[in-house]
Structure formats: structure tokens, C-alpha cells
């Protein structure tokens, strides 16, 4: 066979679908690899061919499109399962070709089992809700294209194992689940089950997502530097180890980049000819507020180092702050014994 542009196995598209449910999978060629869409390709006389490799096998084989009730079918650039079976798991390839052109890509499809409480090995998307913020919604994901707009599905929402019905602050509204007010207690997995009829059969789509309640933007503040502060003086003798922690609190802010850094005499530590190490640790509160600690360490401090300016800086989408550490050279204690001896000698 002639050469084919092989994009390999697209592991970025690790597709997971539930057993015994419909699944529609678009050929990734048109979404990620080629600059034209299926309609253009089709008009140009290109044909889309599907085949697969079963789990734990090496042999590529054609997909059987002649199963009872058209269980597997192809429509334009979409491969349909109505419904999936566990042994549909494998690597699927879509190939676009004519006599002069060929391009193909493979992707893994995993058919996953779920229990009666919707627990499964499925990787769940995370939706963040602001704490005590007012109405926010989550939407039943990835159900477009399964049924025409003329079909009115029934949608049932669950939190964990429990149907959401007259929940205190959560209202099911079709494809949406409205949170009148969100609390930490609303953290968890939410499942929508969409039931729709098709050709005399009833199909179910199960979609689960994780809700994480995070700090509200109305409570967000610029970074707060807890350390260094005015109450602590770092007093060292030359030769001792100097350790200065910079501890900064960041309010949760969606898509904000939180940064902490030290400057020594106005320069980055890497640009100063001294042996400095900086270790960072990060902790999060239940609402994903963040505390970052960067410890600046100089193993054997010199008297020159003790005269330098050490400033901790922090930045988030809410603003930038800085705080200098008070560093001093320890003054040797007066040698009282000698002075007293001199005193006695004078009498």
C-alpha cells in the first residue's frame, strides 16, 4: 500500500465511555490534525475508513457495521455505538484517503463499568463553584448530538448516590443544576442521567462531574505577606546559617498565577555571587486559598551578607506586594568579667 501520513496514537484523546450507553466519537483528524473539515474532504472525493485493534491484540481489523440493530454505525465523521459493550475497548483508527492522499490517526477507547452509585474508573471533570456567592450552575456535559432538539429527554440529577430532590440549596433545572448558594458541604460528585427514546428503544447517558467549592472573588484580597514582618529580626554572627521564611497567603482566584520570589539588594538570588538556596512549599485551604512559603537559606553568612537587603515579593491577579526582612549582625556581648576585674584592680 502507498505511504500514509500516520499521526500515531493520539493519547491526548483518552476517550472513556460507559458500558451499555450510546457513544459518539468524532474522528480526531478533523479536530486536531488537518486544516479542513469532513464536508470539504468528502466533497473532494476523500473517503473516511474506520478500523480497530482489540485490547491486548496487535491485529488491526475492520469494524463490523453489520451488527444487529446497527449497534455500531458511522455517520459522516462520527463513529456511533448504540450502545457500547465492554469488549469494544481498544485502539480505533480513522483513515482519510483517496488514490493520491492518505492520512490516519489512532486513539484509545475505553469502555468503563459503573456501579449503582455511578462510581467508576472514569476520569471526572472538575467544576469550581464560589463559596456563598449566589446562583451558579453546572451543566450536564457532553450530551450534544445524541438526540435531535425535537426530542425532550428526562434528566435526573444525583449527588453521590442520592437523587437531588428538594435539596436545600440545589435545584435541578433540566440539563442545569442550579446552586442557590454553595458551601463546602456541596463538594462531591454530581451525576446527570439523561434518558431519551430513539427508534422504539430507550437510551441512557450518564455524566458525572466533581464539584469543588472555592473561595469567592468577593472575598479575594491582594497577597498577604505574613513573614517576614516587623516583629522578627534575623540577627546572626558571620559563619552562622541564615534562614528567612517568606510566607504568603493568596486568596483563591480562578486562573490566577500566584508568584513568590526573593530579591537580594534588588537582584534575583541567581544574579548575586553568594551561595543561596531557596526551598518552596505550598499548602491549600479547603476553599483552595493558597499559602506559599519560600525559605531563603545562606549556609555560612558573611558580615557582607548581613548588610544586604532581603525582600520577599508576591504577586497574584489581585496585586503585588513586597516586604523586607530585618537582618542584622549580632553585636558581641560586652565582656563584663574583664571590665569588673579592672574595676576591682583600681581600688
Amino acid at each position: 500500500s502507498e505511504r500514509c501520513d500516520d499521526w500515531g496514537l493520539d493519547t491526548m484523546r483518552q476517550i472513556q465511555v460507559f458500558e451499555d450507553e450510546p457513544a459518539r466519537i468524532k474522528c480526531p483528524l478533523f479536530e486536531h490534525f488537518l486544516k479542513f473539515n469532513y464536508s470539504t474532504a468528502h466533497s473532494a472525493g476523500l473517503t473516511l475508513i474506520w478500523y480497530w485493534t482489540r485490547q491486548d491484540r496487535d491485529l488491526e481489523e475492520p469494524i463490523n457495521f453489520r451488527l444487529p440493530e446497527n449497534r455500531i454505525s458511522k455517520e459522516k465523521d462520527v463513529l456511533w455505538f448504540r450502545p457500547t459493550l465492554l469488549n469494544d475497548t481498544g485502539n480505533y483508527t480513522c483513515m482519510l484517503r483517496n488514490t493520491t492522499y492518505c492520512s490516519k490517526v489512532a486513539f484509545p477507547l475505553e469502555v468503563v463499568q459503573k456501579d449503582s452509585c455511578f462510581n467508576s474508573p472514569m476520569k471526572l471533570p472538575v467544576h469550581k463553584l464560589y463559596i456563598e456567592y449566589g446562583i451558579q450552575r453546572i451543566t450536564c456535559p457532553n450530551v450534544d448530538g445524541y438526540f435531535p432538539s425535537s426530542v425532550k429527554p428526562t434528566i435526573t440529577w444525583y449527588m453521590g448516590c442520592y437523587k437531588i430532590q428538594n435539596f436545600n440549596n440545589v435545584i435541578p433545572e433540566g440539563m442545569n443544576l442550579s446552586f442557590l448558594i454553595a458551601f463546602i458541604s456541596n463538594n462531591g460528585n454530581y451525576t446527570c442521567v439523561v434518558t431519551y427514546p430513539e427508534n422504539g428503544r430507550t437510551f441512557h447517558l450518564t455524566r458525572t462531574l466533581t464539584v469543588k467549592v472555592v473561595g469567592s472573588p468577593k472575598n479575594a484580597v491582594p497577597p498577604v505577606i505574613h513573614s517576614p514582618n516587623d516583629h522578627v529580626v534575623y540577627e546572626k554572627e558571620p559563619g552562622e546559617e541564615l534562614l528567612i521564611p517568606c510566607t504568603v497567603y493568596f486568596s483563591f482566584l480562578m486562573d490566577s498565577r500566584n508568584e513568590v520570589w526573593w530579591t537580594i539588594d534588588g537582584k534575583k538570588p541567581d544574579d548575586i555571587p553568594i551561595d543561596v538556596t531557596i526551598n518552596e512549599s505550598i499548602s491549600h485551604s479547603r476553599t483552595e486559598d493558597e499559602t506559599r512559603t519560600q525559605i531563603l537559606s545562606i549556609k555560612k553568612v558573611t558580615s557582607e551578607d548581613l548588610k544586604r537587603s532581603y525582600v520577599c515579593h508576591a504577586r497574584s491577579a489581585k496585586g503585588e506586594v513586597a516586604k523586607a526582612a530585618t537582618v542584622k549582625q549580632k553585636v558581641p556581648a560586652p565582656r563584663y568579667t574583664v571590665e569588673l576585674a579592672c574595676g576591682f584592680g583600681a581600688t
Epitope: 428538594n166 440549596n169 435545584i171 435541578p172 448558594i181
Partner: antibody, heavy 120, light 110 residues
Framework: EQSGGGAEGGLVKPGGSLELCCKA??????????RCWVRQAPGKGLEWIGC?????????YYANWVNGRFTLSRDIDQSTGCLQLNSLTAADTAMYYC???????????WGQGTLVTVSS | ALVMTQTPSPVSAAVGGTVTINCQAS??????LAWFQQKPGQPPKLLIY???TLASGVPSRFSGSGSGTEFTLTISGLQSDDAATYYC????????????FGGGTEVVVK
């Protein structure tokens, strides 16, 4: 259950203000619930005013027609909710009920109501 | 804003009979509807929530059905004690959280 409509209500002049309060005794203090207010003009139907979440004074919802004239508040320690009525007109003459429920809008505990008459 | 329309009013039936009250929502409110009963001089009493779930202590002769924009309250085996005004309450959160009562339906027991 729920103690009466709270404030004694009574006669208020047009343009005047009044605060109605009621105390819920059918919920434990640890329970989160909605405290809502509903009014009923003489011989008319029920009209929803608004709701406040008893666990958080920050979250309140009002009917569109309220237009900032009424304010809901709550004192979580005393399990008391209040409705501040401002810029009152004769059209605000009604029986004002406080109602509570674990579900938003599903009020299973009601106060006996407070009659507010706005007249010069 | 959400508008709830109730029909008919008044409605009358004999003891032991069946009464059906309809409630129509101006928006799709899914199953977010409650029914209340109010007798003269008393506060309302919750009968049904989530369109069809019976509230605690409510006799099974009361039933609710419907979803979306059309809802029904049915009282079968009517008793003289059921003479009251019945209100539907819709819950809608499209822009802000909004509750709206229907205009009420008076039930007369003959």
C-alpha cells in the same frame, strides 16, 4: 413550630417604615434552611417577597417587584429573621407571613402572620 | 419574571368526588413546583413539593403531577375538610432565584 409573625405590625403612614421579625423554633440551629416572606393583601392571593438563607446572611433573593424597598436580614444565634419595609404605600397593606423550609420555596413552617395597614 | 396561572376558580364537587386544579408556568420550571392549601384566617400549608412528592402528614388523596410548564393537583375522595383555596408555587432560577404563586383556586365541597 414557628412562633407568630413577630412584630405586632399595625398602622403605618404612607412613606413610613416598619420592621417585622419572626423566630423559627421548628429547626435546630445547626440546620440550614430558607427563611422566606410572603404577603397576602385582604381578599387576594399569596405573593412571594423574598428568601434569605439562614446559614448565610450574604445570600438573599427578592421578587422583582420589591425593587430595593424591602430588606431581609437574619440573626443566626437567635434564629430570628427580619423583614424591613420602607417607602410603604397603601398597596403594601397586607398580612405578612414568614415561612421556612429546608428547600427553597418549599415552606413547611409558617408564622401566623402580621397585618400591616398603610393609611394616612 | 415567572408568572403562574391557575385554573379554574372556583371549582366545586360533591363529597367523595374528584377535583383537578391546573397550574401553568410562563417558563419551563421542570419539576420545581409546590402546592399549598389555605383555609380562611390561617397561614398556608404545604401539600406537595417537587411537583409530585407528598409533604409529611398529607393524606394520599392529594396527588400532584406534571413537569415543564403544565402541572395538576388532584384531590380524590373529596372530604368536606378539603374546602379551601389552593395555590401553586413555581421556583425558577434563570436570572435570579424567583418564586411565584398562582392566583389561587377556591374548592367548594357540596
Amino acid at each position: 413550630e414557628q412562633s407568630g409573625g413577630g412584630a405586632e405590625g399595625g398602622l403605618v403612614k404612607p412613606g413610613g417604615s416598619l420592621e417585622l421579625c419572626c423566630k423559627a423554633s421548628g429547626f435546630s440551629l445547626s440546620t440550614s434552611y430558607w427563611r422566606c416572606w410572603v404577603r397576602q393583601a385582604p381578599g387576594k392571593g399569596l405573593e412571594w417577597i423574598g428568601c434569605i438563607y439562614a446559614g448565610s446572611g450574604d445570600v438573599t433573593y427578592y421578587a422583582n417587584w420589591v425593587n430595593g424597598r424591602f430588606t431581609l436580614s437574619r440573626d443566626i444565634d437567635q434564629s430570628t429573621g427580619c423583614l424591613q419595609l420602607n417607602s410603604l404605600t397603601a398597596a403594601d397593606t397586607a398580612m405578612y407571613y414568614c415561612a421556612s423550609g429546608v428547600g427553597f420555596g418549599y415552606f413547611n413552617l409558617w408564622g401566623q402572620g402580621t397585618l400591616v395597614t398603610v393609611s394616612s | 419574571a415567572l408568572v403562574m396561572t391557575q385554573t379554574p376558580s372556583p371549582v366545586s364537587a360533591a363529597v367523595g368526588g374528584t377535583v383537578t386544579i391546573n397550574c401553568q408556568a410562563s417558563e419551563d420550571i421542570y419539576s420545581n413546583l409546590a402546592w399549598f392549601q389555605q383555609k380562611p384566617g390561617q397561614p398556608p400549608k404545604l401539600l406537595i413539593y417537587d411537583a409530585s412528592t407528598l409533604a409529611s402528614g398529607v393524606p394520599s388523596r392529594f396527588s400532584g403531577s406534571g413537569s415543564g410548564t403544565e402541572f395538576t393537583l388532584t384531590i380524590s375522595g373529596l372530604q368536606s375538610d378539603d374546602a379551601a383555596t389552593y395555590y401553586c408555587l413555581g421556583v425558577y432560577t434563570h436570572i435570579s432565584a424567583d418564586n411565584a404563586f398562582g392566583g389561587g383556586t377556591e374548592v367548594v365541597v357540596k
